[in-house]
Interface confidence: medium
Amino acid sequence: MNNPIPSNLKSEAKKAAKILREFTEITSRNGPDKIIPAHVIAKAKGLAILSVIKAGFLVTARGGSGIVVARLPDGKWSAPSAIGIAGLGGGFEIGIEVSDLVIILNYDRAVEAFAKGGNLTLGGNLTVAVGPLGRNLEGNVALRSSAAVFTYCKSRGLFAGVSLEGSCLIERKETNRKFYCQDIRAYDILFGDTPRPAQAEDLYEILDSFTEKYENEGQRINARKAAREQRKSSAKELPPKPLSRPQQSSAPVQLNSGSQSNRNEYKLYPGLSSYHERVGNLNQPIEVTALYSFEGQQPGDLNFQAGDRITVISKTDSHFDWWEGKLRGQTGIFPANYVTMN
């Protein structure tokens, strides 16, 4: 059993990675029909991973701690936000000794409900179901659940069919504050204004592996390319720069966040939609000079160092956008606010 006593976010992330492995890897105890299917995690909009503390046999579970991550518009996972769980009832009442939980948030509205409110009650407006198990194909009729939330519980190392309806995920503000060294809301952590901490690399490694598994199973709908095209053509936040404790992370934080009503809205500079008519390919190549170094965040990004001269292939009217450029034979997109016109 994983330690459920609320601790710091670093150990929570480590614990979460361990739990997720236990829920998804085929072992002598977990046969191929006793794991969370890759596509469930690959398609999830959010994921909560917790361990639960129980006062004793036949006694209601008292609560638990863990983390939640959200899927960003570009397909990557957000930084982790610390959470607790309360109001555990259901199967717990009859003595099922649940140790670890994985909660799959299938829809954006489930993630947003938690991020905006700081807590999320399972059930009611958000339908909850025990999540499907096994390496079933995604199209399997039995798996076509419309539930907003899937729950996976383990009891004594085995899956237990407990839906967790009526229990509540709670934002742990103090844990987040201590880890991120600032007062920060779950919304800003989960919706991409916060860097993925290096301490959670284990967790991201296993999360990213599900996307690969899912794609390898022939279920790919070229999500990466679509995300990249969306990022180029629609309003989306620029990559930020280091904000707090850069030694903890190579990815940075952005301060200029905008409207919160829609995850895909332009988060850096609200109200800039009029700037986003594409100028398209340029007749005369424009050269820009990099003010700051930019390390690409995903394939298709253009890496450059401060001082590099980039040939712009296509641009918008706004400096607060992604442009396309060419450097040393490589073509890719880059944040225009990192460069200056020559």
Epitope: C181, Q182, D183, I184, R185, Y187, D188, D193, L238, P240, K241, P242, L243, S244, R245, P246, Q247, Q254, L255, N256, S257, G258, S259, Q260, L268, Y269, P270, G271, L272, L291, Y292, S293, A306, H319, F320, N337
Partner: antibody, heavy 119, light 107 residues
Amino acid sequence: EVQLVESGGGLVQPGGSLRLSCAASGFTFSNYAMSWVRQAPGKGLEWVSAISGSGSSTYYADSVKGRFTISRDNSKNTLYLQMNSLRAEDTAVYYCAKAEYSYLYFDIWGQGTLVTVSS
Amino acid sequence: DIQMTQSPSSLSASVGDRVTITCRASQSISNWLNWYQQKPGKAPKLLIYAASRLQSGVPSRFSGSGSGTDFTLTISSLQPEDFATYYCQQSYSSPWTFGQGTKVEIK
């Protein structure tokens, strides 16, 4: 013309409170993070607090954490700094500053407002 | 927190002199370094950003250089209006910190 005008400074007793305002004009206020920077008499510049464009994220220097609250009203193009439990060492000229391009630098500064904490 | 150390803390120079101010960061900050000028009773004014980029409207006699931990502000030919206090500031990580300032006085 891009302009920032601070107000609300004055004399206050230790333990007292004060609210500073910064009226912005000449740029789309909600698009930019804003910051407060202070300067004690005869001393250097010290960053105090910052707030994101939407107001959803706030940041504080350790010296003011828990006592000062930064906020903004984008409909009024105004930045605020609520200062509670004031101490003698908070005596300074307080400047508001506009942060350009993802907090790369402070490109526009107000003229400053003097806060004196003394009994 | 990243500490910024300027040297010298003050200097005396004459009009036409070449003046150099240095700023050292306690850890590498790449080129996330800005320079400000402040005159008595006035607000600071941005001179240089990204270590070497001249802010619009600032005379070309001001220049900046450096990367990593060591940075320099140079005034190629000191003018009467340049007598002021100069501050470096890192924008690499929060809290954003300033150097203690360098006062340039008339010799």
